[in-house]
Protein backbone atom coordinates (compact mmCIF):
# COMPACT_ATOMS: atom_id res chain seq x y z
CA UNK A 1 0.00 0.00 0.00
CA UNK A 2 1.42 3.33 -1.07
CA UNK A 3 2.35 5.76 1.67
CA UNK A 4 0.92 9.22 1.22
CA UNK A 5 3.29 11.80 -0.22
CA UNK A 6 2.45 15.49 -0.36
CA UNK A 7 4.22 17.13 -3.24
CA UNK A 8 4.75 20.88 -3.29
CA UNK A 9 6.96 21.09 -6.38
CA UNK A 10 7.85 24.77 -6.09
CA UNK A 11 10.29 25.66 -3.34
CA UNK A 12 9.63 29.31 -4.02
CA UNK A 13 7.26 31.50 -6.02
CA UNK A 14 7.71 35.21 -6.73
CA UNK A 15 4.68 37.32 -7.57
CA UNK A 16 4.22 41.04 -8.21
CA UNK A 17 1.90 42.86 -5.83
CA UNK A 18 -1.64 42.91 -7.14
CA UNK A 19 -1.23 39.70 -9.14
CA UNK A 20 -2.31 36.15 -8.32
CA UNK A 21 -0.12 33.40 -6.91
CA UNK A 22 -0.65 29.74 -7.69
CA UNK A 23 0.58 27.38 -4.99
CA UNK A 24 0.84 23.81 -6.23
CA UNK A 25 0.11 20.72 -4.15
CA UNK A 26 -0.61 17.18 -5.20
CA UNK A 27 -1.05 14.04 -3.12
CA UNK A 28 -0.33 10.43 -4.06
CA UNK A 29 -3.05 8.62 -2.09
CA UNK A 30 -6.59 9.17 -0.83
CA UNK A 31 -5.53 7.67 2.50
CA UNK A 32 -5.73 8.36 5.32
CA UNK A 33 -9.29 9.64 5.20
CA UNK A 34 -9.38 13.34 6.03
CA UNK A 35 -9.14 16.85 4.66
CA UNK A 36 -6.36 18.93 3.12
CA UNK A 37 -5.74 22.39 4.55
CA UNK A 38 -3.38 25.21 3.58
CA UNK A 39 -1.47 27.30 6.12
CA UNK A 40 1.03 30.14 5.99
CA UNK A 41 3.86 29.65 8.44
CA UNK A 42 4.47 26.84 10.90
CA UNK A 43 3.91 26.26 14.58
CA UNK A 44 1.24 27.78 16.80
CA UNK A 45 1.31 31.11 15.00
CA UNK A 46 0.51 29.66 11.60
CA UNK A 47 -2.39 31.18 9.69
CA UNK A 48 -5.14 29.16 8.03
CA UNK A 49 -5.27 30.07 4.35
CA UNK A 50 -7.87 27.62 3.03
CA UNK A 51 -9.98 24.65 3.93
CA UNK A 52 -13.43 23.50 2.87
CA UNK A 53 -15.02 23.86 6.30
CA UNK A 54 -14.26 27.37 7.47
CA UNK A 55 -14.22 30.59 5.59
CA UNK A 56 -15.23 32.11 3.34
CA UNK A 57 -11.78 32.73 1.90
CA UNK A 58 -12.62 35.39 -0.69
CA UNK A 59 -9.17 35.67 -2.23
CA UNK A 60 -8.55 31.92 -2.49
CA UNK A 61 -9.82 29.64 -5.24
CA UNK A 62 -9.06 25.99 -5.82
CA UNK A 63 -7.34 25.09 -9.07
CA UNK A 64 -9.32 21.88 -9.44
CA UNK A 65 -13.10 21.76 -9.14
CA UNK A 66 -14.16 21.32 -5.52
CA UNK A 67 -16.65 18.70 -6.73
CA UNK A 68 -14.08 16.60 -8.60
CA UNK A 69 -14.09 12.99 -7.47
CA UNK A 70 -10.94 11.20 -6.33
CA UNK A 71 -9.07 14.45 -6.87
CA UNK A 72 -5.41 14.57 -5.91
CA UNK A 73 -4.67 18.16 -6.93
CA UNK A 74 -5.06 20.54 -4.02
CA UNK A 75 -3.39 23.55 -5.59
CA UNK A 76 -4.80 26.97 -4.77
CA UNK A 77 -4.69 30.43 -6.28
CA UNK A 78 -4.50 33.56 -4.11
CA UNK A 79 -5.60 36.77 -5.80
CA UNK A 80 -4.52 40.38 -5.31
CA UNK A 81 -1.26 39.54 -3.57
CA UNK A 82 0.14 42.11 -1.12
CA UNK A 83 3.43 42.19 0.81
CA UNK A 84 1.53 40.88 3.85
CA UNK A 85 1.06 37.59 1.99
CA UNK A 86 4.79 36.85 1.91
CA UNK A 87 5.78 33.69 3.77
CA UNK A 88 6.00 29.92 3.46
CA UNK A 89 2.82 28.09 2.57
CA UNK A 90 2.21 24.49 3.62
CA UNK A 91 -0.24 21.99 2.15
CA UNK A 92 -1.18 19.67 5.02
CA UNK A 93 -3.14 16.42 5.14
CA UNK A 94 -5.25 15.79 8.23
CA UNK A 95 -6.52 12.46 9.48
CA UNK A 96 -10.26 12.39 10.10
CA UNK A 97 -11.09 12.24 13.79
CA UNK A 98 -12.57 14.10 16.72
CA UNK A 99 -10.84 16.43 16.23
CA UNK A 100 -8.98 15.94 12.95
CA UNK A 101 -5.25 15.54 13.54
CA UNK A 102 -2.34 16.65 11.37
CA UNK A 103 -0.96 13.68 9.46
CA UNK A 104 1.62 14.98 6.99
CA UNK A 105 2.83 18.27 5.57
CA UNK A 106 4.30 19.22 2.26
CA UNK A 107 7.78 20.74 2.25
CA UNK A 108 6.37 24.23 1.81
CA UNK A 109 6.47 26.91 -0.88
CA UNK A 110 7.99 30.28 -0.07
CA UNK A 111 6.02 33.16 -1.55
CA UNK A 112 7.87 36.41 -2.11
CA UNK A 113 6.14 39.59 -3.25
CA UNK A 114 7.76 41.94 -5.73
CA UNK A 115 6.91 45.61 -5.92
CA UNK A 116 4.07 46.44 -8.26
CA UNK A 117 5.54 47.39 -11.65
CA UNK A 118 5.15 51.12 -12.25
Amino acid sequence: EEELQIIQPDKSVSVAAGESAILHCTITSLFPVGPIQWFRGAGPARVLIYNQRQGPFPRVTTVSETTKRENMDFSISISNITPADAGTYYCIKFRKGSPDTEFKSGAGTELSVRAKPS
Epitope: S29, R53, R69, N71
Partner: antibody, heavy 120, light 108 residues
Framework: DVQLVESGGGVVQPGGSLRLSCAAS????????MTWVRQAPGEGLEWVST??????YYADSVKGRFTISRDNSKNTLYLQMNSLRAEDTAVYYC???????????????WGLGTRVTVSS | EIVLTQSPATLSVSPGERATFSCRAS??????LAWYQQRPGQAPRLLIY???IRETGIPERFSGSGSGTEFTLTITSLQSEDFAVYYC??????????FGGGTKVEIK
Protein backbone atom coordinates in the same frame (compact mmCIF):
# COMPACT_ATOMS: atom_id res chain seq x y z
CA ASP B 1 -18.24 -3.35 -13.82
CA VAL B 2 -18.06 -2.68 -10.09
CA GLN B 3 -19.56 -5.51 -8.06
CA LEU B 4 -20.06 -5.81 -4.31
CA VAL B 5 -21.39 -9.09 -2.95
CA GLU B 6 -22.21 -9.43 0.74
CA SER B 7 -22.44 -12.72 2.61
CA GLY B 8 -22.47 -14.05 6.15
CA GLY B 9 -25.90 -12.92 7.30
CA GLY B 10 -28.29 -15.17 9.14
CA VAL B 11 -30.29 -15.68 12.32
CA VAL B 12 -28.46 -15.33 15.62
CA GLN B 13 -29.50 -15.14 19.26
CA PRO B 14 -29.05 -11.96 21.30
CA GLY B 15 -25.50 -11.78 22.58
CA GLY B 16 -24.24 -13.84 19.66
CA SER B 17 -21.78 -13.01 16.89
CA LEU B 18 -21.68 -12.92 13.11
CA ARG B 19 -19.03 -11.99 10.58
CA LEU B 20 -20.18 -10.36 7.37
CA SER B 21 -18.04 -10.32 4.24
CA CYS B 22 -18.18 -8.19 1.11
CA ALA B 23 -16.33 -9.40 -1.97
CA ALA B 24 -15.41 -6.50 -4.26
CA SER B 25 -14.44 -6.54 -7.92
CA UNK B 26 -14.21 -4.18 -10.87
CA UNK B 27 -12.18 -1.42 -9.20
CA UNK B 28 -8.90 -0.91 -7.34
CA UNK B 29 -10.23 -2.02 -3.98
CA UNK B 30 -7.17 -0.98 -1.95
CA UNK B 31 -7.44 2.63 -3.16
CA UNK B 32 -10.89 3.35 -1.74
CA UNK B 33 -12.54 3.67 1.62
CA MET B 34 -15.39 1.22 2.19
CA THR B 35 -18.53 1.46 4.29
CA TRP B 36 -21.26 -0.63 5.88
CA VAL B 37 -24.80 0.81 5.95
CA ARG B 38 -27.78 -1.01 7.42
CA GLN B 39 -31.53 -0.84 7.03
CA ALA B 40 -33.88 -2.19 9.67
CA PRO B 41 -37.15 -3.72 8.41
CA GLY B 42 -39.41 -0.96 7.07
CA GLU B 43 -36.96 1.74 8.15
CA GLY B 44 -34.47 4.10 6.54
CA LEU B 45 -30.73 3.89 6.01
CA GLU B 46 -28.27 4.02 8.91
CA TRP B 47 -24.52 4.39 8.54
CA VAL B 48 -22.63 1.73 10.52
CA SER B 49 -18.91 1.94 9.85
CA THR B 50 -16.24 3.13 7.41
CA UNK B 51 -12.65 2.01 6.88
CA UNK B 52 -9.89 3.82 5.00
CA UNK B 53 -6.46 2.21 4.89
CA UNK B 54 -6.23 1.36 8.56
CA UNK B 55 -8.37 4.16 9.95
CA UNK B 56 -11.80 3.06 11.14
CA TYR B 57 -14.97 4.93 12.09
CA TYR B 58 -18.11 3.69 13.82
CA ALA B 59 -21.63 4.80 14.64
CA ASP B 60 -22.14 5.23 18.38
CA SER B 61 -24.77 2.50 18.31
CA VAL B 62 -22.20 -0.17 17.35
CA LYS B 63 -18.97 1.20 18.83
CA GLY B 64 -17.21 -1.40 20.96
CA ARG B 65 -19.31 -4.24 19.54
CA PHE B 66 -18.60 -4.17 15.80
CA THR B 67 -15.20 -4.22 14.09
CA ILE B 68 -14.67 -3.29 10.45
CA SER B 69 -11.62 -4.62 8.62
CA ARG B 70 -10.38 -5.28 5.11
CA ASP B 71 -8.06 -7.68 3.32
CA ASN B 72 -6.75 -5.90 0.24
CA SER B 73 -5.08 -9.08 -1.03
CA LYS B 74 -8.53 -10.69 -1.19
CA ASN B 75 -10.47 -7.57 -2.21
CA THR B 76 -12.75 -8.23 0.73
CA LEU B 77 -14.36 -6.06 3.39
CA TYR B 78 -15.49 -7.52 6.73
CA LEU B 79 -17.76 -6.60 9.60
CA GLN B 80 -17.33 -8.59 12.80
CA MET B 81 -20.46 -8.17 14.89
CA ASN B 82 -20.38 -9.20 18.55
CA SER B 83 -22.84 -8.83 21.44
CA LEU B 84 -25.67 -8.61 18.94
CA ARG B 85 -28.97 -7.07 20.00
CA ALA B 86 -32.50 -7.23 18.61
CA GLU B 87 -32.09 -3.67 17.32
CA ASP B 88 -29.20 -4.83 15.09
CA THR B 89 -31.72 -6.73 12.96
CA ALA B 90 -31.38 -5.27 9.47
CA VAL B 91 -30.19 -5.73 5.93
CA TYR B 92 -26.49 -4.84 5.88
CA TYR B 93 -25.15 -3.20 2.75
CA CYS B 94 -21.54 -2.88 1.73
CA UNK B 95 -20.80 0.33 -0.19
CA UNK B 96 -17.82 1.82 -2.00
CA UNK B 97 -16.90 5.34 -0.96
CA UNK B 98 -16.29 8.09 -3.46
CA UNK B 99 -14.34 11.08 -2.19
CA UNK B 100 -15.15 14.58 -3.36
CA UNK B 101 -12.05 16.72 -3.68
CA UNK B 102 -12.13 19.00 -0.66
CA UNK B 103 -15.11 17.42 1.09
CA UNK B 104 -16.22 14.06 2.42
CA UNK B 105 -17.48 10.77 1.09
CA UNK B 106 -20.68 9.48 -0.42
CA UNK B 107 -21.42 5.99 -1.69
CA UNK B 108 -21.38 5.35 -5.41
CA UNK B 109 -21.79 1.56 -5.51
CA TRP B 110 -23.78 -0.69 -3.21
CA GLY B 111 -24.11 -4.43 -2.82
CA LEU B 112 -27.50 -6.13 -2.67
CA GLY B 113 -27.18 -6.62 1.09
CA THR B 114 -27.22 -9.52 3.51
CA ARG B 115 -29.95 -9.98 6.11
CA VAL B 116 -29.13 -10.25 9.80
CA THR B 117 -31.85 -11.29 12.24
CA VAL B 118 -31.21 -11.18 15.98
CA SER B 119 -33.89 -13.12 17.77
CA SER B 120 -34.29 -15.63 20.55
CA GLU C 1 -24.65 15.13 14.65
CA ILE C 2 -26.32 16.70 11.63
CA VAL C 3 -29.99 15.76 11.33
CA LEU C 4 -31.58 15.61 7.88
CA THR C 5 -35.35 16.00 7.65
CA GLN C 6 -37.07 14.97 4.43
CA SER C 7 -40.51 16.09 3.42
CA PRO C 8 -43.04 15.01 2.57
CA ALA C 9 -42.77 11.47 3.93
CA THR C 10 -44.97 10.27 1.07
CA LEU C 11 -45.70 11.90 -2.27
CA SER C 12 -48.51 10.66 -4.53
CA VAL C 13 -47.87 11.55 -8.16
CA SER C 14 -49.32 10.46 -11.48
CA PRO C 15 -46.95 9.12 -14.16
CA GLY C 16 -45.73 11.92 -16.39
CA GLU C 17 -46.10 14.53 -13.66
CA ARG C 18 -43.36 16.39 -11.83
CA ALA C 19 -42.23 15.43 -8.32
CA THR C 20 -40.37 17.79 -6.01
CA PHE C 21 -39.31 16.96 -2.48
CA SER C 22 -36.97 18.45 0.05
CA CYS C 23 -34.20 17.68 2.49
CA ARG C 24 -33.48 20.12 5.32
CA ALA C 25 -30.24 19.96 7.32
CA SER C 26 -30.05 20.98 10.98
CA UNK C 27 -26.90 22.97 10.19
CA UNK C 28 -25.03 24.25 7.14
CA UNK C 29 -23.63 21.40 5.03
CA UNK C 30 -22.59 23.67 2.14
CA UNK C 31 -23.04 21.48 -0.97
CA UNK C 32 -21.98 18.22 0.65
CA LEU C 33 -25.20 16.35 0.02
CA ALA C 34 -26.07 13.26 -1.99
CA TRP C 35 -29.38 11.76 -3.11
CA TYR C 36 -30.13 8.04 -3.47
CA GLN C 37 -33.02 6.09 -4.96
CA GLN C 38 -34.13 2.80 -3.48
CA ARG C 39 -36.63 0.71 -5.38
CA PRO C 40 -38.55 -1.99 -3.46
CA GLY C 41 -36.33 -4.94 -2.62
CA GLN C 42 -33.25 -3.31 -4.14
CA ALA C 43 -30.09 -1.63 -2.88
CA PRO C 44 -29.85 2.17 -2.88
CA ARG C 45 -28.50 3.81 -6.05
CA LEU C 46 -26.59 7.08 -6.17
CA LEU C 47 -28.43 9.76 -8.16
CA ILE C 48 -26.87 13.11 -7.23
CA TYR C 49 -23.79 14.27 -5.36
CA UNK C 50 -22.45 17.70 -4.42
CA UNK C 51 -26.13 18.73 -4.20
CA UNK C 52 -26.55 19.10 -7.97
CA ILE C 53 -24.22 16.81 -9.95
CA ARG C 54 -25.92 13.85 -11.61
CA GLU C 55 -24.10 10.55 -11.30
CA THR C 56 -23.03 8.99 -14.60
CA GLY C 57 -25.93 7.20 -16.25
CA ILE C 58 -28.67 8.98 -14.30
CA PRO C 59 -31.38 10.40 -16.60
CA GLU C 60 -31.65 14.17 -17.04
CA ARG C 61 -35.13 14.19 -15.55
CA PHE C 62 -33.44 13.99 -12.13
CA SER C 63 -32.04 17.27 -10.83
CA GLY C 64 -30.77 18.47 -7.49
CA SER C 65 -30.58 22.01 -6.17
CA GLY C 66 -29.96 23.96 -3.00
CA SER C 67 -27.09 24.61 -0.63
CA GLY C 68 -26.52 25.26 3.04
CA THR C 69 -29.52 23.79 4.82
CA GLU C 70 -32.23 23.53 2.13
CA PHE C 71 -32.04 21.02 -0.72
CA THR C 72 -34.48 19.82 -3.34
CA LEU C 73 -34.66 16.81 -5.62
CA THR C 74 -36.87 17.21 -8.67
CA ILE C 75 -38.02 14.52 -11.07
CA THR C 76 -39.67 15.86 -14.19
CA SER C 77 -42.13 13.62 -15.99
CA LEU C 78 -42.14 10.63 -13.64
CA GLN C 79 -41.62 7.23 -15.23
CA SER C 80 -42.91 3.96 -13.81
CA GLU C 81 -39.40 3.01 -12.63
CA ASP C 82 -39.13 6.23 -10.60
CA PHE C 83 -41.67 5.14 -8.01
CA ALA C 84 -39.35 4.40 -5.11
CA VAL C 85 -38.00 5.82 -1.86
CA TYR C 86 -35.51 8.69 -2.07
CA TYR C 87 -32.92 9.44 0.63
CA CYS C 88 -30.59 12.38 1.13
CA UNK C 89 -27.21 11.99 2.85
CA UNK C 90 -24.81 14.60 4.18
CA UNK C 91 -21.04 14.16 4.12
CA UNK C 92 -20.07 17.60 5.35
CA UNK C 93 -19.49 16.59 8.95
CA UNK C 94 -18.83 12.99 9.85
CA UNK C 95 -18.70 10.66 11.67
CA UNK C 96 -21.49 9.97 11.59
CA UNK C 97 -22.65 10.13 8.01
CA UNK C 98 -26.36 10.81 8.29
CA PHE C 99 -29.32 10.07 6.04
CA GLY C 100 -32.74 11.62 5.89
CA GLY C 101 -35.75 9.51 6.76
CA GLY C 102 -36.73 9.16 3.11
CA THR C 103 -39.54 10.26 0.83
CA LYS C 104 -41.68 7.57 -0.73
CA VAL C 105 -42.94 8.45 -4.20
CA GLU C 106 -46.04 6.41 -4.94
CA ILE C 107 -48.43 6.20 -7.86
CA LYS C 108 -51.48 8.43 -7.54
Amino acid sequence: DVQLVESGGGVVQPGGSLRLSCAASGFSFSNFAMTWVRQAPGEGLEWVSTIGSGDTYYADSVKGRFTISRDNSKNTLYLQMNSLRAEDTAVYYCAKDSTVSWSGDFFDYWGLGTRVTVSS
Amino acid sequence: EIVLTQSPATLSVSPGERATFSCRASQNVKNDLAWYQQRPGQAPRLLIYAARIRETGIPERFSGSGSGTEFTLTITSLQSEDFAVYYCQQYYDWPPFTFGGGTKVEIK
